[in-house]
């Protein structure tokens, strides 16, 4: 394989490395109160935390990025914590033809990795 | 749709926002000199730059993240610049049975977005 194995233990201490965290947001927070009817509050899972060398590397590119960041930190950024998968969520909203249901596949993160 | 349209013009000035940049790297830089034979130097396209509000948002989640970062910057990180797609690259490397060609699909970035 083109890379060392990504590591899963956080060298920075508990809760500091890339992980999933729940953020409460109202429709007002999101600017959606004029068109979304329900839910009125969302539990949004988001990816937060740092990406130390080889921690939860998304792929070969992320491993290279981590290595080159160590060599050229001003030129190559460290990998960052982004969703690896999503949980679909249904929203009820207003449309011109009435109340409509729509499933969003890319709204709530389900897992995170360093890319 | 669940979000405003992502914008493509960088409000921070030329070259400051999320974009693709070429980084030269040798096999030694990558720690691959003991097993990769060719190429001896790689032109690695990587994603660099900032992700200001709604710039090249990857999806609905990224748009929400940008909005909540504006409201709760200590709790929600800004979106960051990561690959949206990759260019496959062929490496020639040593194996127990001789020289082998292998295509890596996730090594060189082809496009970038803010996730």
């Amino acid at each position: 394989s083109a890379h060392a194995h990504p590591r899963d233990s956080c060298p920075l201490g508990p809760g500091r490395c890339c992980h999933l965290e729940t953020v409460q947001a109202t429709l007002e927070d999101l600017g959606w109160s004029d068109w979304v009817l329900s839910p009125r509050q969302l539990q949004l899972s988001m990816c937060v935390g740092e990406c130390p060398h080889l921690y939860r590397s998304a792929n070969t590119h992320a491993q290279i990025k981590a290595r080159l960041h160590g060599l050229q930190p001003d030129k190559v950024p460290a990998p960052c914590c982004v969703p690896s998968s999503y949980t679909p969520v249904v929203l009820m909203h207003r449309t011109d033809s009435g109340v409509s249901l729509q499933t969003y596949d890319d709204l709530v993160a389900r897992g995170c990795h360093c890319a | 749709s669940a979000h405003a349209h992502p914008r493509d013009s960088c409000p921070l000035g030329p070259g400051r926002c999320c974009h693709l940049e070429t980084v030269q790297a040798t096999l030694e830089d990558l720690g691959w000199s003991d097993w990769v034979l060719s190429p001896r130097q790689l032109q690695l396209s990587m994603c660099v730059g900032e992700c200001p509000h709604l710039y090249r948002s990857a999806n609905t989640h990224a748009q929400i993240k940008a909005r909540l970062h504006g409201l709760q910057p200590d709790k929600v990180p800004a979106p960051c610049c990561v690959p949206s797609s990759y260019t496959p690259v062929v490496l020639m490397h040593r194996t127990d049975s001789g020289v082998s060609l292998q295509t890596y699909d996730d090594l060189v970035a082809r496009g970038c977005h803010c996730a």
Epitope: S38, P88, V90, L91, V99 | -
Partner: antibody
Framework: QVTLKESGPGILQPSQTLSLTCSFS??????????VSWIRQPSGKGLEWLAL???????RYNPSLKSRLTISKDASSNQVFLKITSVDTADTATYYC??????????WGQGTLVTVSA | EIVLTQSPALMAASPGEKVTITCSVS???????LHWYQQKSETSPKPWIY???NLASGVPVRFSGSGSGTSYSLTISSMEAEDAATYYC?????????FGAGTKLELK
């Protein structure tokens, strides 16, 4: 296109257990916010909510019947089940299965008539 | 539990007439938690109005809903034959979820 179809025994005797199945398509019960409810309606009468199950397996029951009701789901096969124990003639009704996203009875099945008779 | 009282229980209206059905709630609820459903004989109920005033998809614009607190209403600006049905109000403010007894609207 969302569809829900209820199936049940049609007729059963007092004291037996009523088992109802709701088979649905056009949505997933693995989607956040999605739920499925059961509501019944005796002939010529009003609507009575029985139970509700959400995507995260949160279950809600009508307290007046709670001791007799069990709702469950098989999200992978798109089915929801309701069991009512110790039925009597007052349980004779049309039973509806309803797609219930967040806080609304959005799509209703055609209903299945259940008759409890000695 | 929250009790919903509809009135009238039965009414008849002529084509073109304005119709108002009321729903009184035993304790104050948020307007976003009061819904209406329409049922025609021998068919399943249909969602009609969500959150007091938002028409379900396909509901004619002659229908409207209003209210707050403990008092809600459904209004038809101009009765048409296809509007003859039973209308139920329902609350989603607290469990158990409850319905009004229904208002049967007939064509005169």
């Amino acid at each position: 296109q969302v569809t829900l179809k209820e199936s049940g025994p049609g007729i059963l005797q007092p004291s037996q257990t009523l088992s109802l199945t709701c088979s649905f398509s056009g949505f997933s019960l693995s989607t956040s916010g999605m739920g499925v409810s059961w509501i019944r309606q005796p002939s010529g009468k009003g609507l009575e909510w029985l139970a509700l199950i959400y995507w995260d397996d949160d279950k809600r029951y009508n307290p007046s019947l709670k001791s007799r009701l069990t709702i469950s789901k098989d999200a992978s096969s798109n089915q929801v089940f309701l069991k009512i124990t110790s039925v009597d003639t007052a349980d004779t009704a049309t039973y509806y299965c309803i797609q219930s996203p967040w806080d609304w009875f959005a799509y209703w099945g055609q209903g299945t008539l259940v008759t409890v008779s000695a | 539990e929250i009790v919903l009282t509809q009135s009238p229980a039965l009414m008849a209206a002529s084509p073109g007439e304005k119709v108002t059905i009321t729903c009184s709630v035993s304790s104050s609820i948020s307007s976003s938690n009061l819904h209406w459903y329409q049922q025609k004989s021998e068919t399943s109920p249909k969602p009609w109005i969500y959150g007091t005033s938002n028409l379900a998809s396909g509901v004619p614009v002659r229908f409207s809903g209003s209210g707050s607190g403990t008092s809600y209403s459904l209004t038809i600006s101009s009765m048409e034959a296809e509007d003859a049905a039973t209308y139920y109000c329902q609350q989603w403010s607290s469990y158990p979820l409850t319905f009004g007894a229904g208002t049967k609207l007939e064509l005169k």
